[in-house]
Each structure stands twice: as C-alpha cells, then as structure tokens.
C-alpha cells in the first residue's frame, strides 16, 4: 500500500517517499523507483537555507550601498547574505533593508536623549499626565493642558498621544 | 522623489554671518521635520538643529545655542539656517534632512569655510 506519510526529510510524490535535497543544494528530479532524489548545488551567489524540493535557489541578498548598506556577513550556499548600516547609521528593521542616521519616537512615546554620533535616539513612553502626537527625533513628551489654570474643565480626557480637551465650566442659574 | 538642495555656504571670517538654504521637493514639507547636520573634514555628522514641521518648537546643540537660529517657510518649501558669531570650529558642510532620515535622501550639503 503507498504511503500517506514521509519521514523527516522526505517528501510523498507520487505515492512514494522521496529525499529532500540538503541546505546547498536544489531538485533536479524527483526519486523513482528506482532512482534516489536528483539534487544540484547551488550557484555562485545563491543559498537555499533549509532542507527542500525547491527547483530554483534563492538568490543572495544585495547590500546596495546607495541606500547605505554593506556586507556584515557574506552568504555561503546555505545562508543569505547579511546586511548592515555604514557607521554611525542605524538598520530600520531586523532585515536591515535600509539605513537611518537615527531612530525617531512614534507618537506615546518623546525623545530621552538626542541621538549622537555613537548612540540612536532613546525613547520613553509619555508617562500619565504627558502625551506626544507626533513622530520626532527631539521632542520630548508635553505634559497635558491644565483646564483648570484656565477657569474650564476637562470635556475629554488626555491619553499618552493626546492632550486633554478643556472646555466651559457648566454654570448653574 | 525626496530631492534636498542645500545653497548659502561659502567663506566667511571668524564672527561673520551666513544664511543658509535647503528647497525641499518630492514630498509633503509642511508635514516633516526637519534638521541640519554637518560633517567637518575626518569627522562624523554633528546634529545642529531642528524644526517640527510648525516652525513652533525647536532643537539647538549646545555648541550653537544661542548663534544659530533655524526656520522655515512651508508655502515657498525651504528650511533655513541663520548663522551668526561664526568660528573656525563651524567650518563643514552642512546638510539639511528630513524624518526619518534616509540614507539615501540626503542632498549634496554646502560647504560653510570660517577663516580670516
């Protein structure tokens, strides 16, 4: 009876359990039966990083140094290639597609201190009371309006990314 | 396209002044901020100063509080610098740039000299 199930590292075509082709390497052809799985390495600047039946490599990350980036780790045929920041940029996320000088805080958050030539911006979120509507690379959280100070109460409440809305005190006739 | 365009650098003596330019395109201007750095001859960037997109609040490093003040002009697009009491320590060029700031969206910079 045909298998429904494969091992680790096969895979079921038809009706039969064949080898995965090892990180490095392709399919070139499906196993028979009477021949094992056809595997191919892959080529110069490509890697295929997992146990697979993929019929084409991946091709190598570029580090496009227009946008910044260079080579933190060359890629073999198992592992892509690893970008990083010329000096003193930073990554805008862990794939390290593009370069920043510095990171800004995102509005809830205001700016700790200012980045410098060897340190990223720091961000603290807005503390009760503070808010920051705004994305920014210096300015820190404002503390809420005092409705008070200004003979009118609170109509809505502040939250870390808006101040409080004041307005006219309710006058009893 | 972002597209920056520094102008206003030039040689100027110790204790003179110089007003620079950056004409900003490509995006929306009135919703950025925006800074000014400098990079002198073999140094990093230095942070100068910077504008929320309101021109209400602003940012000065310590080594050109009170000499330098920044501005900006959302209907015409440009970001301005004006540099008063300048010393030699202020020679470089400067860039201006916008949030975030985008390896790949920086102008050309211009070149400020302060020497007699």
């Known amino acids: 009876e045909p298998p429904t199930a494969c091992r680790e590292k096969q895979y079921l075509i038809n009706s039969q359990c064949c080898s995965l082709c090892q990180p490095g390497q392709k399919l070139v052809s499906d196993c028979t039966e009477f021949t094992e799985t056809e595997c191919l390495p892959c080529g110069e600047s490509e890697f295929l990083d997992t146990w697979n039946r993929e019929t084409h490599c991946h091709q190598h990350k570029y580090c496009d140094p227009n946008l910044g980036l260079r080579v933190q780790q060359k890629g073999t045929s198992e592992t892509d290639t690893i970008c990083t920041c010329e000096e003193g940029w930073h990554c805008t996320s862990e794939a390290c597609e593009s370069c920043v000088l510095h990171r800004s805080c995102s509005p809830g958050f205001g700016v700790k201190q200012i980045a410098t030539g060897v340190s990223d911006t720091i961000c603290e979120p807005c503390p009760v009371g503070f808010f920051s509507n705004v994305s920014s690379a210096f300015e820190k959280c404002h503390p809420w309006t005092s409705c008070e100070t200004k003979d009118l109460v609170v109509q809505q409440a502040g939250t870390n990314k808006t101040d409080v809305v004041c307005g006219p005190q309710d006058r009893l006739r | 396209e972002v597209q920056l365009l520094e102008s206003g650098g030039g040689l100027v003596q110790p204790g003179g002044s110089l007003r620079l330019s950056c004409a900003a395109s490509?995006?929306?201007?009135?919703?950025?901020?925006m800074w000014w750095f400098r990079q002198a001859p073999g140094k990093g960037l230095e942070r100068v100063s910077a504008i929320n997109p309101q021109g209400t609040r602003t940012y000065y490093a310590d080594s050109v509080m009170g000499r330098f003040t920044i501005s900006r002009d959302n209907s015409k697009n440009t970001l301005y610098l004006q540099m008063n009491s300048l010393r030699a320590e202020d020679t470089a060029v400067y860039y201006c740039?916008?949030?975030?700031?985008?390896?790949?969206?920086r102008g050309q910079g211009t070149l400020v000299t302060v020497s007699s």
């Open positions: 490509g995006f929306t201007f009135a919703g950025y901020e």
């Open positions: 740039a916008k949030l975030p700031f985008m390896f790949d969206d």
